[in-house]
């Protein structure tokens, strides 16, 4: 039977999505106990039937990976959680409409920072996602977001930064002082979806200039 207030057993049912890995999470309510079990269903926009997620039925953990089930980039999804307490009380709550394109956040890019004597090179590695193309290969963020670009910044001192940006993967900051430490930050930007990743940061030191020794 339904509790007087579903929030007594179940709260904050939501998708947490990063780089298209879509995890359903929730919290127990004030009357939830460690032996409360949770069952997860999902569906697409406008469909009547909820589909039970295998591996997430009568579980006690408070998360469920729905990445595979929510992998269509143009689809809208919902998920819902039914909590059943040891005493047989139950509560069901559903997520808001979920679009992975709209709602996923971007992790910092994977970058290799290479020190040289008077320059620092930064190589951005393509970011894989769980999304698969028709032929089965995994798409990168660059495949999904056609307007994706990288924004790179090199902190030279407290008052001066150098900036580079573009769609290419390799960048180099020139004209630097040898044997000096710099802080580099690299972000992914997707203007059409107003997305900006957290920065990847590398602290690098230019090589000493050996030509005078």
């Amino acid at each position: 039977h339904a509790p007087e207030d579903p929030s007594d057993l179940l709260q904050h049912v939501k998708f947490q999505s990063s780089n298209f890995e879509n995890i359903l999470t929730w919290d127990s309510g004030p009357e939830g106990t460690p032996d409360t079990v949770y069952s997860i269903e999902y569906k697409t926009y406008g469909e009547r039937d909820w589909v039970a997620k295998k591996g997430c039925q009568r579980i006690t953990r408070k998360s469920c990976n729905l990445t595979v089930e929510t992998g269509n980039l143009t689809e809208l999804y919902y998920a819902r959680v039914t909590a059943v307490s040891a005493g047989g009380r139950s509560a069901t709550k559903m997520t808001d409409r979920f679009s992975s394109l709209q709602h996923t956040t971007l992790k910092p890019p994977d970058v290799t920072c290479i020190s040289k004597v008077r320059s620092i090179q930064m190589i951005v590695h393509p970011t894989p996602t769980p999304i698969r193309a028709g032929d089965g290969h995994r798409l990168t963020l660059e495949d999904i977001f056609h307007d994706l670009f990288y924004h790179l910044e090199l902190q030279v001192n407290r008052t001066y930064q150098m900036h580079l940006g573009g769609k290419q993967r390799e960048y180099e900051f020139f004209g630097l002082t040898p044997d000096t430490e710099f802080l580099g930050t690299i972000m992914i930007c997707v203007p059409t979806w107003a997305k900006e990743s957290a920065p990847y940061m590398c602290r690098v030191k230019t090589l000493p200039d050996r030509t005078w020794t």
């Epitope: 339904a2 049912v13 406008g46 143009t74 689809e75 709550k93 559903m94 997520t95």
Partner: antibody
């Protein structure tokens, strides 16, 4: 059996407010979206907005955004429509209707008459 | 907003004859994710709330007689009552759920000739 029962209609003065209730039974309100639709006498159907009762997230028809507020009380399994600054043209039967796209269950409606 | 326009506004059909109602949307209702159209049809009898007949343009709601069928794609849709019965006298509405705000056609009144 799913049932939606609206209440709270009646005669309201122009410039006044109304608060309509939609009591759900036969299912948990938090298991689906709830919509409000109105129908002026002898006229067509007009969507006011929707609420996700689990989260309280709302989407309104821009026409009503400034005057309508959708809320729920999960413990009462009841959804509410509050409308302010009422005028004669708000005279209508107000329905609550379930689901997120089209509407599979409707209440019987409650008549609101705005008149002095 | 998507404008839904129904035609005719009313029609009179003999018992047992076919009734056809058209609904035109101001933009395509084709939902790319499932290649279905975001269109529903409702029946409303006097003093009653609307009743869902058809969703996704052509899927019949459970319990709805099979004389009711929906067809069409993109911007042009049709509700057909293959053999009109006395209990089918009502106003019929189409509704789009492709984008906010959800909008309805102005309604078509079906009567017996």
């Amino acid at each position: 059996e799913v049932q939606l029962v609206e209440s709270g209609g009646g005669l309201v003065q122009p410039g006044g407010s109304l608060r309509l209730s939609c009591a759900a039974s036969g299912y948990s309100l938090t298991a689906d979206y709830m919509n409000w639709v109105r129908q002026a006498p002898g006229k067509g159907l007009e969507w006011i907005g929707e609420i996700n009762p689990s989260t309280g997230t709302t989407t309104y028809n821009q026409k009503f955004e400034a005057r309508a507020t959708l809320t729920v009380d999960q413990s009462k399994n009841t959804a509410y429509l509050q409308m302010n600054s009422l005028r004669a043209e708000d005279t209508a039967v107000y329905y609550c209707a379930r689901f997120d796209a089209y509407f599979d269950y409707w209440g019987q409606g409650t008549l609101v008459t705005v008149s002095s | 907003d998507i404008v839904m326009t129904q035609s005719p506004d009313s029609l009179a059909v003999s018992l047992g004859e076919r009734a056809t109602i058209n609904c035109k949307s101001s933009q395509s209702l084709l939902y790319s994710s499932n290649q279905k159209n975001c269109l529903a049809w409702y029946q409303q009898k006097p003093g009653q709330p609307p009743k869902l007949l058809i969703y996704w343009a052509s899927s019949r709601e459970s319990g709805v007689p099979d004389r009711f069928s929906g067809s069409g794609s993109g911007t042009d849709f049709t509700l057909t009552i293959s053999s009109l019965q006395a209990e089918d006298v009502a106003v019929y509405y189409c509704q789009q759920y492709f984008s906010y705000p959800f909008t309805f056609g102005q309604g078509t009144k079906v009567e017996i000739k």
